[in-house]
């Protein structure tokens, strides 16, 4: 049978930026860094100043979803983390401004942010069973679980 793709008609409206300039560390104490113009990867850094700093923007769902829906932007840029398919790298998409409304295929820009203690998970809104993940010797990607690492610690500067 032909593959079936369901695109929800839920609309997500931008509310505000809720976190600025934070770092994502995975469970192996690796930080997310820029691999190139398009991809991210993870490495245990000698100097954390080399890690990517992210901003997090919150969106409100027309469905009144209880989940926190967010967009991830590299701080001081116009680059946004964008989901592809399972085991595919997340991409950095350049946009002139943060989208005020997101729906349909554009939901690949959005993630459900869940926290369990100090562990943070980012599930793709477009692919609700897949998480932002790190994988050994690979880009930051979308994955369903092990062997990829799907839990992150958010490091906010405590200066």
């Amino acid at each position: 049978s032909a593959p079936f793709s369901f695109l929800s008609n839920v609309k997500y409206n931008f509310m505000r930026i809720i976190k600025y300039e934070f770092i994502l560390n995975d469970a192996l104490n690796q930080s997310i860094i820029r691999a190139n113009d398009q991809y991210l990867t993870a490495a245990a850094l000698h100097n954390l100043d080399e890690a990517v700093k992210f901003d997090m923007g919150a969106y409100k769902s027309s469905k009144d979803d209880a989940k926190i829906t967010v967009i991830l932007r590299i701080s001081k840029t116009q680059l946004y983390v964008t989901a592809q398919d399972e085991d595919q790298p997340v991409l950095l998409k350049e946009m002139p401004e943060i989208p005020k409304t997101i729906t349909g295929s554009e939901t690949n820009l959005l993630f459900f942010w869940e926290t369990h203690g100090t562990k943070n998970y980012f599930t793709s809104v477009a692919h609700p069973n897949l998480f932002i993940a790190t994988k050994q010797d690979y880009w930051v990607c979308l994955a369903g679980g092990p062997p990829s690492i799907t839990d992150f610690q958010i490091l906010e500067n405590q200066a």
């Epitope: 560390n25 192996l28 000698h46 100097n47 954390l48 490091l155 500067n157």
Partner: nanobody, 124 residues
């Protein structure tokens, strides 16, 4: 040869302050995260705080957050820990260390170099 030399420990009353220093040599100081760890009498090593190579990012254990401040002067190759509102449970030998890799040492951290430590005793 890499060397880390801590100083500034001593006896202080509860609520008091101390400033620890760590003089580093033998490596390019500003290219590395640095951390403070401590070992209380009869206990294991506890991570206290980390600072990035350029000093742009700092992070603290919950037990010291709001009371301790980590900083560094890369022109002097020196790491600092300002300790305020000291409590009896802060009594420990404090070590500065250079992590082998990574930043937050609460779960995953190994050190390639650390100092000989400086004793901080908080008691009335």
């Amino acid at each position: 040869e890499v060397q880390l030399l801590e100083s500034g420990g001593g006896l202080v009353q509860p609520g008091g302050s101390l400033r620890l220093s760590c003089a580093a040599s033998g490596f390019t100081f500003n290219e590395y995260n640095m951390v403070w760890v401590r070992q209380a009498p009869g206990k294991g090593l506890e991570w206290v705080s980390s600072i990035s190579g350029g000093g742009g990012f700092t992070y603290y254990a919950d037990s010291v957050k709001g009371r301790f401040t980590i900083s560094r002067d890369n022109s002097k190759n020196t790491l600092y820990l300002q300790m305020n509102s000291l409590r009896a449970e802060d009594t420990a030998v404090y070590y500065c260390a250079k992590p082998l890799r990574g930043f937050v040492c609460s779960q995953h951290c190994s050190f390639d170099y650390w100092g000989q430590g400086t004793l901080v005793t908080v008691s009335s």
